[in-house]
Interface confidence: low
């Protein structure tokens, strides 16, 4: 058993670890979400640039200083291109999010074009259809009961949107497959202790060829991809969606990560690699946006003045556009976009951010040298609630994202999508599908707290991402038609 004197020997301050768990006892026992634990650790040493912590028995560095973060995420990205998630690359392990630096380069170059403005505009009509179906469903339900648990409800919208935009699946045509949601949700909601095992014995999962993904999830994505490949006769269909791109890669047979295209650094595009990408797009496309929208609706219920301003903006923009929500009108709504940004400040979904040093590295502005393979962690939540950067951080205030205010802040004081080259590839997609749906909701409903609205909302400890414990209950009140 490694001893907990690694950081002491290097004169790096940090909280006292406990045997076996290091500093992660509460998250390992699923008493608290990992993101919340990291925020607490961040807050323990307000004067330190970096904090030495232990994830189970592995020493890691939690970085607090924004200039150091800028080096790690942007300036010295080459050293930190790897996320340091070590498990079997069979199954779903070779996905774009978890892939090592080289695999990520090979894949990332290929997938970035999916999210150009032109492609997003093409996807918009599919999102629109999903949003209309969603609103029809809410309207119908409203006649029976005005209280909704919006988190699970919004998952049905984002699930159908990602299915349509990425895979060309219209879920209404699949009937009982509509709720593929459940399968995918297993990943996020059912705790796997494989992650803790990796923290204790880095590389063990890889060595034993163990995955962190349940077999049922792997099988689901295999059959999803098999069906779509069969439907399209193994060739791109001309839809130019995510699946077409994957089929192009499948025809190529491999992709290379370096600019010379040497086969030594090429990634063979097997059906397993394809399944892995399908998986990560699904997860990233539905859960993050659904949770963000749910939290945004929660804050609008608790802040009627802000909601009124948003409704006024939505009404005004829709009136000027014959009642139509378009790709451009969504971008036009300044206050709506600011409210979305403020939601992500308060509820950054992916916590913590993680990188691995690919060589020894001296932390700028300190005497600390971290060894090759050390995991570096960043707590967006810690930063986002730090009064040093945000006054009255627990208050929902979209005005923090006025251009002038943003300009005054350090560029690394806001990290909901990560930062640098390995930031969130789908952030524009997520914003678009979220703001479209919120616009539709506000054009038809006023959101109010219900008798079951939890005003002291906790973070679900069992989920890998940030999410509301027990869901979010609010009332949706149909707005009376005003002539």
């Amino acid at each position: 058993m490694r001893t907990f004197n690694y950081w002491k020997k290097r004169n790096v301050r940090g909280p006292e670890p406990v045997v076996f768990f290091g500093n992660l006892k509460d998250s390992a026992l699923r008493k608290k979400n990992m993101g919340v634990v990291m925020e607490e650790l961040y807050n323990m040493f307000p004067e330190e640039k970096v904090i030495g912590i232990y994830r189970m028995t592995s020493p890691c560095l939690l970085v607090r200083d924004l200039d150091v973060i800028k080096h790690i995420m942007i300036k010295d990205f080459e050293v930190f291109s790897d996320r340091g998630v070590e498990f079997s690359k069979e199954g779903l392990g070779s996905n774009l999010f978890h892939a090592d630096g080289e695999t990520w380069r090979a894949l990332g170059n290929r997938f970035t074009p999916i999210f150009t403005s032109g492609k997003l505009k093409n996807m918009f009509y599919l999102m629109h259809e999903g949003a209309d179906n969603f609103i029809d469903h809410v309207s119908a339900e409203c006649e029976k009961n005005q209280e909704f648990e919006v988190h699970s409800l919004l998952q049905t919208y984002t699930m159908s949107t990602i299915a349509a935009c990425a895979f060309g699946i219209s879920y209404d045509s699949i009937g009982d497959k509509v709720k593929a949601l459940d399968i995918v949700d297993k990943i996020i909601s059912e705790p796997s202790y494989a992650i803790e095992l990796d923290m204790m014995y880095p590389g063990l999962l890889s060595k034993l060829n163990l995955s962190i993904f349940p077999t049922v999830v792997k099988n689901f994505f295999k059959s999803l991809v098999d069906n779509i490949v069969a439907q399209r006769n193994g060739k791109p269909s001309g839809r130019n969606d995510f699946m077409d791109l994957i089929l192009e890669l499948r025809q190529l047979g491999e992709v290379t990560s370096n600019k010379y295209g040497s086969s030594a650094s090429s990634l063979e595009i097997t059906d397993e690699v394809i399944c892995a990408q399908a998986f990560v797009f699904y997860i990233a496309g539905y859960e993050t946006s659904a949770t963000t929208m749910a939290y945004m609706i929660y804050q609008l219920a608790l802040n009627p003045d802000i909601q009124n301003k948003l409704i006024a903006e939505v009404d005004e923009v829709l009136k000027a556009n014959d009642g139509k929500v378009t790709y451009d009108t969504v971008k036009e709504m300044k206050y709506l976009n600011k409210a979305f940004d403020e939601t992500l400040r308060m509820y950054s979904i992916v916590e913590p951010l993680q990188r691995k040093a690919t060589r020894d590295y001296k932390i700028p502005g300190t005497d600390v040298v971290i060894e090759k393979d050390t995991i570096v962690l960043i707590s967006p939540r810690g930063i986002h609630y730090d009064p040093k950067y945000y006054d009255n951080p627990k208050q929902f205030n979209p005005d923090r994202f006025d251009a002038e205010e943003v300009g005054k802040r350090h560029p690394c004081a806001y990290l909901p999508f990560g930062l640098g080259q390995r930031n969130c590839i789908g952030m524009r997609f997520g914003r678009l599908q979220s703001l479209l749906c919120i616009t539709k909701i506000l054009s038809k409903f006023r959101i109010e707290p219900s008798k079951n609205t939890d005003r002291n909302l906790q973070v679900e400890p069992h989920r890998g991402l940030i999410g509301p414990k027990g869901g979010i209950r609010v009332n949706a009140i149909p707005r009376k038609l005003v002539s």
């Epitope: 469903h137 339900e141 029976k144 909704f148 648990e149 699970s152 409800l153 049905t156 009982d176 497959k177 509509v178 709720k179 593929a180 459940d182 399968i183 949700d185 297993k186 059912e190 049922v216 689901f220």
Partner: nanobody
Framework: QVQLQESGGGSVQAGGSLRLSCAAS????????MGWFRQAPGKERELVAD????????YYSDSVKGRFTISRDNAKNTVYLEIDSLKPGDTAVYYC????????????WGQGTQVTVSS
């Protein structure tokens, strides 16, 4: 395990109505959605409607939209299928099924109830 018991089937004239019920018992907390399927003689079993327990999200197959209404009573752990304007083509064994969280296919089935529509 989830046990399902259908009732309400029978013989009816074309244009008539029926209300099928499906009572669930056992580990119903694991059940995420309930569906009604039907199987006509010599044909494959098809999903006609389903409903999620949590948020009441509903699906209808195109062939029954407008004539079939699925609803639920969470307190009674019961799902209903209201069938209006019955046609001879609706003659089939109607099965109630339940789907657990974490699965895409329906994994618990009732015994089925016969619906016969005569012209």
């Amino acid at each position: 395990q989830v046990q399902l018991q259908e009732s309400g089937g029978g013989s009816v004239q074309a244009g008539g109505s029926l209300r099928l019920s499906c009572a669930a018992s056992g580990r119903t907390s694991r059940s995420y959605a309930m569906g009604w399927f039907r199987q006509a003689p010599g044909k494959e079993r098809e999903l006609v409607a389903d409903i999620a327990w949590s948020d009441g999200r509903i699906y209808y197959s195109d062939s029954v939209k407008g004539r079939f209404t699925i609803s639920r009573d969470n307190a009674k752990n019961t799902v209903y299928l209201e069938i209006d304007s019955l046609k001879p083509g609706d003659t089939a064994v109607y099965y109630c099924a339940s789907r657990a969280r974490g699965t895409v296919s329906y994994n618990y089935w009732g015994q089925g109830t016969q619906v016969t529509v005569s012209s």
